[in-house]
């Protein structure tokens, strides 16, 4: 069974800067990621990135840069505002849309006793909505 | 089959504000961004921002920040480019487009003359 | 922001003809993570919207003609049509589909000789 891994790290040298990670782990091709925050894409959550393997990305505040780390996991660098932090609190959610297995998404977030520059354990959960 | 089909032409006089529109249909609205290009006469391609119809966030090229504003209204699967304080260098014909650049909308002539 | 360079500005040639347009990107469009190249192509015609022909560099869009073909990796990139047919007398656009804000080269007109 197809499974997606969510890791949420604030950066040490700046706290207000976090970087989602996601990756999936299963037979297929990618053909779409998608980054969301809040909940999972089209459930409650709000799209923050969409990476398309040959297409590019596109992305909205406060997503700064998303891309590809491998062929089957991406980075998302989000910049946080505000100074109360609410990514502390925040799921973010990555959906896999793969060949032929269907989309598989999986959320995560910070550990509350996050120190900075600490990741949160791989958080596989799997939402099994295999659309 | 998708489509886009965007509002008809404007005439605007200079520091004034055009709206146009883009209806789209054949896909689901909101699970598409939608992104916005125009073109100078004679001129090449410019990008300009892109659109989340599903959350209403939109992100801007900078040349364009401030005097831009990207919205939709998901009930009628509409998306809305508005460009304020508008010069004769804004005479151009704007375009939406979707699902990457793939589905193009037929352009909307913007005039800037006083 | 990237600049997108094309070349050359126009073409002239025949019909049957093989042409090789040319764009260049001021930064490498190749993402490291799974190699792949954030370079699209268009077409377009008078008085008509862009056409996407290639992306990823090298992809062809569903229903595009096999005469065209896209190379190139890194800041390099080519558009090849193989033999030039009557309908293929047009303008050509390169994209960065990488780095926002995500900028068109100035063009190659391609006409009737």
């Known amino acids: 069974t197809p499974e997606v891994w969510v890791q949420v790290q604030m950066e040490a040298t700046e706290l207000s800067s976090f970087t989602v990670h996601c990756g999936f782990l299963g037979p297929g091709s990618i053909s779409l990621v998608t980054v969301s925050w809040g909940g999972p894409d089209g459930a409650g959550g709000t799209k923050l990135a969409v990476l398309h393997p040959e297409l590019g990305t596109r992305q909205w505040a406060p997503a700064r840069q998303a891309r590809w780390e491998t062929q089957s996991s991406i980075s998302l660098a989000l910049e946080d505002s505000g100074a109360s932090s609410p990514f502390a609190n925040t799921t973010f959610c990555c959906k896999f849309a793969s060949f032929p297995e269907g989309s598989w998404e999986s959320c995560g977030s910070l550990p509350p006793s996050s120190d900075p520059g600490l990741s949160a354990p791989p958080t596989p959960v799997p939402i099994l909505r295999a659309d | 089959q998708v489509q886009l089909v965007q509002s008809g032409a404007e005439v605007k006089k200079p520091g004034a504000s055009v709206k146009v529109s883009c209806k789209a249909s054949?896909?689901?609205?909101?699970?598409?961004?939608i992104e916005w290009v125009r073109q100078a006469p004679g001129q090449g391609l410019e990008w300009m921002g892109v659109?989340?119809?599903?959350?209403?966030?939109?992100n801007y090229a900078q040349k364009f920040q401030g005097r831009v504003t990207m919205t939709r209204d998901t009930s009628i699967s509409t998306a809305y480019m508005e460009l304020s304080r508008l010069r004769s260098d804004d005479t151009a014909v704007y375009y939406c487009a979707s699902h990457w650049l793939a589905y193009w909308g037929q352009g909307t002539t913007v005039t800037v003359s006083s | 922001e990237i600049v997108m360079t094309q070349s050359p500005p126009t073409l002239s040639l025949s019909p049957g003809e093989r042409v090789t347009l040319s764009c260049r990107s001021s930064q490498s469009l190749l993402s490291s993570g799974n190699q792949k190249n954030y370079l699209s192509w268009y077409q377009q015609k008078p008085g008509q919207a862009p056409r996407l022909l290639i992306y990823?560099?090298?992809t062809r869009e569903t229903g595009i003609p096999a005469r065209f073909s896209g190379s190139g990796s890194g800041t390099d990139f080519t558009l090849t049509i193989s033999s030039l047919q009557p309908e293929d007398f047009a303008v050509y656009y390169c994209q960065n589909g990488h780095f926002y804000p995500y900028t068109f080269g100035g063009g190659t007109k391609l006409e009737i000789k």
């Open positions: 990823g560099a090298s």
């Open positions: 659109i989340n119809p599903g959350s209403g966030d939109a």
């Open positions: 054949g896909y689901t609205f909101i699970n598409n961004f």
